[in-house]
C-alpha cells in the first residue's frame, strides 16, 4: 500500500494575514487565525513528517480584501509560490479582473500548475493563453505519479468576467474524456481538484469513473468528522464518501473558506490505484500554530503599499452620501441607492441577447450601513471612507429567488418598523409600497420589478412564481437580521465580489458620484 | 499473501437455503469489493452480486433479487453469501474473488464452494 | 444488461500455434474488458485487465487488444499449460457480465 496525503484549501479569498474567528480582519491578535504565514507553518511540519504530501487549492483565491484590490493577484501568485503549492483550480472569481487580470500576476507568475479541463478558449485568446492553464497535471509523488485534473463552474460567465472567447462546458462531459486519458497513460491515482460547489463535487465523484478522490470549494462547505473546534456546523463526514455509479468509493473533501483550515486528507491506495482507505478531518489554524517568522516579514513589507492605498481618492461626490441609521432603518436613502447602482453595476453581464442583463434586483439591509460620507471634504472619497459605511468585510452575492419568497422579504422589512432595526430594506431595480397602516406581514401594497428579458427596461409587478436573481449582501443571504426565509427559500446562491471593492471600482469607473432620493420605496400612508 | 479462503461442499434439498462464506486474508478486507460469481456444471462464469464490507453496501443482478443475501464480517474478515429457496438448476461451484474498481476485474478468487441441490 | 458474445466457442491447436480469441459487447464498454483463463476444477485466474495490461506474473506471450465493442486476446505461441477454457468480462456497466468461453483444446 502507497499513502498520500493531500492538504488542501479553497475560497481563500484574499485572507492573506490572519483574520478573526469570522474571517474579518484580526483584532486581536491572540485570538486570530489562518493567513498564509500560519498556513506554512502547519505545511511544513506536515511535510517534514510525512512522506508524500501534496498541497492544493481548489480555486477562488482572487478577491475578498484590500489585497486583490491593490495587488491584482500577484499577491495570490507570489505567497502561493512561497507555500510550494503543487497544483491550483480556477475558480469563478479568478476570472473578476477579466482574463488579462488572470493571465498577467497570476498564470505567467505561478511556478505550480493552474489546472481546469472544462474552460476551452477559442479566438484570438487560445494561443495566447495556450499552455498557461492545463486540463490536467500528472505530478511526481516520491515514487508515483498522481493525476490532477481540474474543473471551473460553468456558471463563471454569470459570476465574473471571463469574456467572449472561453467557453465553460459542462464539468462531467469535459472531465470523463480527461481521465479516460490519464488511465491510457497508466496513471491510476487521480484527484479531480475544481470549483463548482459541493453538490457538483459530488455528482463528479458518482458520473467521472477513474477520479479516485474529488477535492473541492465554491460552496465553502465544512466537513467535519467528530467534534467541531470552532463555529462552522459540519455539512457532513470528512471525508464525505459517494458511492460511483460503478460501485467505487470516493471520498469527497472540503475545508470551509478563507484559509482558516488546512483540509487534511490521508488517502492509501494499493499498487493498482485502488484506494483501500481514506481518513482526515480540517485542521483549524488558530493561534496555537505560529505564523512563520520569514513569511509573516515578507507579508508585512506588502502590507505597506495597503496602508497607503486607503487614504487615496478613489473618486468624488458632490452630494452627502447618507449613510446614517436615522435615514436607512426608516426610508429610502441615497447610501443604500449607491450601493445597490454599484451592486448592479458589479453584476453586468450581457451574456445573452434576448437580456439586458442576467440580474436587475438589489436589496441590502440598512442595517448593514455603518456610516455617511461627508461631501463637503473636498468631495473625496477614499477606502477608508468606504470601510467606514461597509465595516464587515463581506460579500455581495449572486442568489436565485421565488417571487414570494421576496415578497416575505419585504414584509419582514417592515413588519416592526419605527424601531430603528437594521432588517430594513435598502433597494435597486425594485419599486416598493408599504401602507404602515396595516398589520404586519401584510404591509407590502406595491412590488414592482424591473425586467430582465427586455432592451427597454422597464418595470412590472412581482409575479410569485416566477424566479428571479437578485443581488444582495451574503449577511442576508445566510438568514442574517431576521430574513430566515431567503435562507431556507433560496434557490441558489453563489458567492460574489467583496462590498467595499464592489463600490470603490463603482466610484472610481464613475469618478464623479450624485446619488438621489428618487422615490424606490414609498408609503402610502402619505405621513413619510 | 493475499487469498481467499471458502468453506466447504453443501448438499442441499430443493427449498432450503445455503450459506457459504469467504475468509480473506493478507490485505485490507474492508478495502475491496467482494464479489460472488458461480458456475453451473459444464457453464460459463455468471455474476451473481458483490458486497463492499468497508459500509456493508450491496449490488445484486435481477436474476438472484430478493433470493440472495450478502454480508460482511469485518472483525474476522469474511464474507458470506445466502441464497434461499433453492432450486435443482441452483447446483454449481460458487466463487467468491475480490474486485478490483480501477477496471473491475477480479484479480484474487476463491478455491469454490460445490453446492449440489438434489432430492 | 450488456451481453457479451465470445467467439469461437472452442478451437483445436498445436504447441507453438497463434491463438486468437474474439469477444463482441452488446454496447461500447470503453475498454473495461478483462480476460480470465480457467482449467477444469480450478477457479478463474485473471490474464489481462483494461483491454491489454498483463496482470502481474501473466507470461508475455498472452496479448490483448480492441476497442468499442470488439475486442481480442491473443497467444502468440501456445504452451503446453495454456490448454484451458477463456472468459471474457465487461467491466464498464453493472451488472459485470461474462462471456460464455472458448475453450482451447489441443489439436
Known amino acids: 500500500a502507497w499513502e498520500l496525503t493531500i492538504l488542501h484549501t479553497n475560497d481563500v479569498h484574499s485572507r492573506l494575514e490572519q483574520t478573526s474567528e469570522d474571517s474579518s480582519k484580526c483584532v486581536n491578535a491572540s485570538r486570530c487565525m489562518g493567513g498564509v504565514a500560519r498556513l506554512f507553518t502547519k505545511v511544513q511540519q506536515i511535510r517534514r513528517a510525512e512522506p508524500n504530501v501534496l498541497l492544493l487549492d481548489a480555486g477562488d483565491q482572487y478577491q475578498g480584501t484590500i489585497w486583490f484590490t491593490v495587488y491584482k493577484g500577484a499577491e495570490v501568485a507570489h505567497f502561493m509560490n512561497a507555500l510550494r503549492y503543487d497544483a491550483m483550480a480556477l475558480g469563478n472569481h479568478e476570472f473578476d479582473n477579466g482574463v488579462e487580470g488572470l493571465i498577467e500576476p497570476l498564470l505567467k507568475e505561478a511556478k505550480f500548475p493552474i489546472l481546469s479541463a472544462n474552460i476551452k478558449a477559442k479566438g484570438p485568446l487560445a494561443s495566447q493563453i495556450s499552455g498557461l492553464y492545463l486540463p490536467y497535471k500528472v505530478l511526481p509523488v516520491g515514487d508515483e505519479v498522481v493525476g490532477i485534473v481540474g474543473y471551473t463552474s460553468k456558471e463563471t460567465p454569470f459570476l465574473s468576467n471571463p469574456g467572449t472567447n472561453l467557453v465553460f462546458e459542462d464539468e462531467i462531459t469535459a472531465l470523463q474524456p480527461e481521465v479516460d486519458k490519464l488511465k491510457t497513460l497508466n496513471v491510476n491515482k487521480i484527484i479531480a481538484l475544481g470549483h463548482s460547489g459541493f453538490e457538483m463535487d459530488k455528482l463528479i465523484a458518482q458520473k467521472v469513473r477513474g477520479v479516485d478522490v474529488v477535492v473541492g470549494g465554491h460552496s465553502n462547505t465544512f466537513l467535519y468528522t467528530g467534534n467541531p473546534p470552532s463555529k462552522e456546523v459540519p455539512a457532513g463526514k470528512y471525508p464525505f464518501i459517494v458511492t460511483s455509479d460503478d460501485g467505487r468509493k470516493v471520498p469527497v473533501v472540503q475545508a470551509y473558506a478563507f484559509g482558516k483550515y488546512l483540509g487534511y486528507l490521508k488517502i492509501e491506495f494499493d499498487e493498482r490505484g485502488n484506494v483501500i482507505s481514506s481518513h482526515g478531518n480540517p485542521i483549524l489554524l488558530n493561534s496555537s500554530i505560529p505564523e512563520d517568522p520569514s513569511i509573516k516579514a515578507d507579508i508585512n513589507k506588502w502590507r505597506i503599499k495597503l496602508d497607503n492605498y486607503s487614504t487615496q481618492e478613489l473618486g468624488k461626490t458632490i452630494v452627502y452620501l447618507d449613510g446614517s441609521s436615522q435615514s436607512c432603518r426608516f426610508r429610502e436613502c441615497n447610501m443604500g441607492n449607491l450601493i445597490c447602482d454599484a451592486m448592479i453595476n458589479n453584476n453586468l453581464r450581457h451574456t445573452d441577447e434576448m437580456f439586458w442583463n442576467h440580474v436587475s434586483m438589489c436589496i441590502l439591509n440598512g442595517g448593514g450601513i455603518r456610516s455617511p460620507i461627508d461631501e463637503r471634504n473636498n468631495g473625496t472619497i477614499t477606502w477608508e471612507n468606504l470601510a467606514a459605511v461597509l465595516p464587515f468585510g463581506g460579500t455581495f452575492d449572486l442568489v436565485q429567488l421565488k417571487g414570494s419568497t421576496l415578497k416575505k422579504a419585504f414584509e419582514h422589512s417592515v413588519h416592526r418598523y419605527g424601531q430603528s432595526t437594521g432588517e430594513f430594506l435598502q433597494v435597486g431595480g425594485i419599486h416598493v409600497v408599504y401602507d404602515l397602516s396595516r398589520k404586519p406581514g401584510d404591509r407590502v401594497v406595491k412590488l414592482d420589478v424591473l425586467c430582465t428579458k427586455c432592451r427597454v427596461p422597464s418595470y412590472d409587478p412581482l409575479k410569485m412564481d416566477e424566479v428571479y436573481k437578485v443581488i444582495l449582501p451574503n449577511f442576508l443571504a445566510n438568514g442574517g437580521d431576521g430574513f430566515q426565509m431567503i435562507k431556507d427559500e433560496l434557490l441558489r446562491h453563489d458567492s460574489g465580489d467583496q462590498d467595499i471593492n464592489v463600490v470603490s471600482t463603482y466610484i472610481s469607473k464613475m469618478k464623479v458620484i450624485y446619488p438621489a432620493v428618487e422615490g424606490r420605496i414609498k408609503f402610502s400612508t402619505g405621513s413619510h | 499473501q493475499v487469498q481467499l479462503v471458502q468453506s466447504g461442499a453443501e448438499v442441499k434439498k430443493p427449498g432450503a437455503s445455503v450459506k457459504v462464506s469467504c475468509k480473506a486474508s493478507?490485505?485490507?478486507?474492508?478495502?475491496?469489493?467482494i464479489q460472488w460469481v458461480r458456475q453451473a456444471p459444464g457453464q460459463g462464469l455468471e455474476w451473481m452480486g458483490a458486497i463492499y464490507p468497508g459500509d456493508s453496501d450491496t449490488r445484486y443482478t435481477q436474476k438472484f433479487q430478493g433470493r440472495v443475501t450478502m454480508t460482511a464480517d469485518t472483525s474476522i474478515s469474511t464474507a458470506y453469501m445466502e441464497l434461499s429457496r433453492l432450486r435443482s438448476d441452483d447446483t454449481a461451484v460458487y466463487y467468491c474473488?475480490?474486485?478490483?474498481?480501477?477496471?473491475?476485474?477480479?484479480?484474487?478468487w476463491g478455491q469454490g464452494t460445490t453446492v449440489t441441490v438434489s432430492s | 444488461d450488456i451481453q457479451m458474445t465470445q467467439s469461437p466457442s472452442s478451437l483445436s491447436a498445436s504447441v507453438g500455434d497463434r491463438v486468437t480469441i474474439t469477444c463482441r459487447a452488446s454496447q461500447d464498454i470503453s475498454n473495461y474488458l478483462n480476460w480470465y483463463q480457467q482449467k477444469p476444477g480450478k477457479a478463474p485466474k485473471l490474464l489481462i485487465h483494461y483491454t491489454s495490461r498483463l496482470h502481474s506474473g501473466v507470461p508475455s506471450r498472452f496479448s490483448g487488444s480492441g476497442s468499442g465493442t470488439d475486442y481480442t486476446l491473443t497467444i502468440s505461441s501456445l504452451q503446453p499449460e495454456d490448454f484451458a477454457t477463456y472468459y471474457c468480462q465487461q467491466g464498464d456497466t453493472l451488472p459485470w457480465t461474462f462471456g460464455q468461453g472458448t475453450k482451447v483444446e489441443i489439436k
Open positions: 474473488a475480490r474486485g478490483n474498481w480501477d477496471d473491475w476485474d477480479f484479480d484474487v
Open positions: 493478507g490485505y485490507t478486507f474492508t478495502g475491496y469489493w
